[in-house]
């Protein structure tokens, strides 16, 4: 039994890191393998992650971690019984995939303005709380070509757009994702989408 693709890990910069790897053949990850991990820290202890299958030869492990700080470094040991298959390390701050924003809501009761709000996925004491920027994706269910992205580069988790920038009388969906420039993160997953019917009063034509 050998490792074909070494484990690569990403952290949510809060409490979970996800590691994925591939073996050289079909493997029952949960019965045959164990991933041991430990924070390099005077008061830390070793933890064991039981991997799950991720395709025939692929394995994935969800590591529960202490609250992350930038200096953290974890040792990783992949075992098959008594055999050490791979040894490595992982700095969560260097491989961050933020959590997805939540509670996306479209407020349509503001005069001809759409107000989209969502929740920051981090608590205020987390470093990423004040460093997230967002991308909002809005698309028409009726017209695949009517697909747009709004970049929200300020900290407030909201976006205002004129309802008239979208077509009236049809349904739209929106979703939002996040990233943090400070740690050069990847984009988060998209939030669940929310749907609304776009309608607004056309301005009276004056002759």
């Amino acid at each position: 039994m050998k490792v074909l693709q070494e484990p690569t890990c990403v952290s949510d910069y809060m409490s979970i890191s996800t590691c994925e790897w591939k073996m050289n053949g079909p493997t029952n990850c949960s019965t045959e393998l164990r991933l041991l991990y430990q924070l390099v820290f005077l008061l830390s202890e070793a933890h064991t992650c039981i991997p799950e299958n991720n395709g025939g030869a692929g394995c994935v492990c969800h590591l529960l971690m202490d609250d992350v700080v930038s200096a953290d470094n974890y040792t990783l040991d992949l075992w098959a019984g008594q055999q050490l298959l791979w040894k490595g390390s992982f700095k969560p701050s260097e491989h961050v995939k933020p959590r997805a924003p939540g509670n996306l809501t479209v407020h349509t009761n503001v005069s001809d303005t759409l107000l989209l709000t969502w929740s920051n996925p981090y608590p205020p004491d987390n470093y990423l709380y004040n460093h997230l920027t967002y991308a909002v994706n809005i698309w028409s269910e009726n017209d695949p070509a009517d697909f747009r992205i709004y970049n929200v580069t300020y900290l407030e988790p909201s976006l205002r757009i004129a309802a008239s920038t979208l077509k009236s009388g049809i349904s739209y969906r929106a979703r939002v994702r996040a990233w943090a420039q400070c740690y050069n993160t990847t984009w988060s997953e998209w939030s669940p989408s929310t749907k609304w019917h776009n309608s607004y009063r056309e301005p009276f034509e004056q002759h």
Epitope: S15, V40, F41, L42, L43, S44, E45, M65, D66, D67, V69, S70, A71, D72, P123, P124, D125
Partner: antibody, heavy 115, light 109 residues
Framework: EVQLVQSGGGLVHPGGSLRLSCAGS????????MFWVRQAPGKGLEWVSG???????NYADSVKGRFTISRDNAKNSLYLQMNSLRAEDMAVYYC?????????WGQGTLVTVSS | EIVLTQSPGTLSLSPGERATLSCRAS???????LAWYQQKPGQAPRLLIF???SRAPGIPDRFSGSGSGTDFTLTISRLEPEDFAVYYC??????????FGQGTKVEIK
């Protein structure tokens, strides 16, 4: 908002015992190492003890064998049991949340050791 | 045990002046684990700098940290009235644990 609220200080005779408490809120207590740091009157800061998320502990040589740090994650609380207290243990004791450094501190509680 | 020695013991300056505080370690310290704190009378310490040079959230940019190995510096570019306080450096070591310097008092001249 992160808060660390301390209690349990007071006056104790040399050789006596005292238990300090620190209640945490506004963060996930169980995922954080916790510490005690003290400051004798007019002196500098001295690290006393720390406890990891899994219960691993460490102590400054000056208190080893006399002080015991513990935590109750269900109550979001940190404790310091101080036995065989000496005059040189008299200080303001702070609880702190952190790891390699301490971004969050309690308000401090004064421990007076005097006969 | 790693010993941190701060100098000077007291720094007498006027508002608007530049303050340079030194912290010297008895052996090499990882920059990742070097921090600076400010403490005012009757208050708990406040983290200013971590990782030798990163400002903690909410700390004004007049505070900066630098250094590596055994020599570290905290600089306050222009002293404000609220900056007069005692400053401590602190280090963490995987075997020796946590230690503080003895402090530098920045007082009004």
């Amino acid at each position: 908002e992160v808060q660390l609220v301390q209690s349990g200080g007071g006056l104790v005779h040399p050789g006596g015992s005292l238990r300090l408490s620190c209640a945490g809120s506004g963060f996930t207590f169980s995922r954080n190492a916790m510490f005690w740091v003290r400051q004798a009157p007019g002196k500098g800061l001295e690290w006393v003890s720390g406890i990891g998320t899994g219960g691993a502990t460490n102590y400054a040589d000056s208190v080893k064998g006399r002080f015991t740090i513990s935590r109750d994650n269900a109550k979001n609380s940190l404790y310091l049991q101080m036995n065989s207290l000496r005059a040189e243990d008299m200080a303001v004791y702070y609880c702190a949340r952190g790891r390699y450094y301490f971004p969050w501190w309690g308000q401090g509680t004064l421990v007076t050791v005097s006969s | 045990e790693i010993v941190l020695t701060q100098s000077p013991g007291t720094l007498s300056l006027s508002p608007g002046e530049r303050a340079t505080l030194s912290c010297r370690a008895s052996q090499s310290v990882s920059s990742s684990y070097l921090a600076w704190y400010q403490q005012k009378p009757g208050q708990a310490p406040r983290l200013l700098i971590f990782g030798a040079s990163s400002r903690a959230p909410g700390i004004p940019d007049r505070f900066s940290g630098s250094g590596s190995g055994t020599d570290f510096t905290l600089t306050i570019s222009r002293l404000e009235p609220e900056d007069f306080a005692v400053y401590y450096c602190q280090q963490y070591d995987h075997s020796a644990g946590w230690t503080f310097g003895q402090g530098t008092k920045v007082e009004i001249k």
